[in-house]
């Protein structure tokens, strides 16, 4: 397992731009994955979205998300994943241990894992982007 060098925290605007890009890429990944018919999402897998020990806007759990996406890449090498990982790397600010992920061995269960994590990643990025872009808006109807 490797660790990344410590970087300065990014300002909110920078994070927002990266998350916007990730949100777009996550939709591309999900669309690609959803082309596989007859696969249902599973309740057995949960992608961590936020880091428990960081403050907004730098609290997206990029190391864990990256580890899950690397696992998907091993199971089914989607070209968009490399680009996603590249962007996630920009959001990693300190040394982080690699997240250990139990990979299903059954072929169908692998497909469920890929679909579930891809869907949760897309939803995580949407929620993260909303939390970043809504802070400055007025609470009006």
């Amino acid at each position: 397992s490797h660790t990344l060098p410590v970087r300065l925290l990014r300002p909110s605007d920078d994070v927002q731009k990266i998350v916007e890009e990730l949100q777009s890429l996550s939709k591309m990944l999900l669309k690609d994955v959803e082309e596989e018919k007859g696969v249902l999402v599973s309740q057995n897998y949960t992608l961590p979205c936020l880091s428990p020990d960081a403050q907004p806007p730098n609290n997206i759990h990029s190391p864990a998300i990256r580890a899950y996406l690397k696992t998907i890449r091993q199971l089914d090498n989607k070209s968009v994943i490399d680009e996603i990982i590249e962007h996630l790397d920009k959001l990693i600010f300190q040394d982080a241990p690699e997240t250990n992920i139990s990979v299903p061995t059954d072929t169908h269960e692998c497909k469920r894992f890929i679909l579930t994590i891809s869907q949760q990643f897309s939803e995580c990025m949407d929620l993260a982007l909303k939390s970043l872009t809504s802070g400055a808006q007025q609470a009006t109807t």
């Epitope: 949100q23 999402v41 979205c49 939803e123 995580c124 909303k130 808006q137």
Partner: nanobody
Framework: EVQLVESGGGLVQPGGSLRLSCAAS????????MGWFRQAPGKEREYVGG????????YNSESMKGRFTISRDNAKNTLYLQMNSLRAEDTAVYYC???????????WGQGTQVTVSS
Amino acid sequence: EVQLVESGGGLVQPGGSLRLSCAASGGTFSSYTMGWFRQAPGKEREYVGGISSSGYVMYNSESMKGRFTISRDNAKNTLYLQMNSLRAEDTAVYYCAAGTIGRPYDYWGQGTQVTVSS
């Protein structure tokens, strides 16, 4: 256009619980990503957490994740925020918000006041 109405706020003692509701009308509730925010007097609005249309939940902090639970009932067009072990610093106006995928929260409720005091 979606209308959102919060309810369930009030005065509660430290350590107590409250369950906030957000009733939605005027749109297809099940297709919206929903969120909770709060604003304490003299402070910026703070994100509490959100829930996707499929029920994937994200909280703003581990502290909130431990004490707060966000859920939704698509059949009742209602979003919930269950708050346990309330503290004085949780005193704020709580707002719910709705938005479609890929957009900010476009629709907001008027808020419900939560006061935690002995």
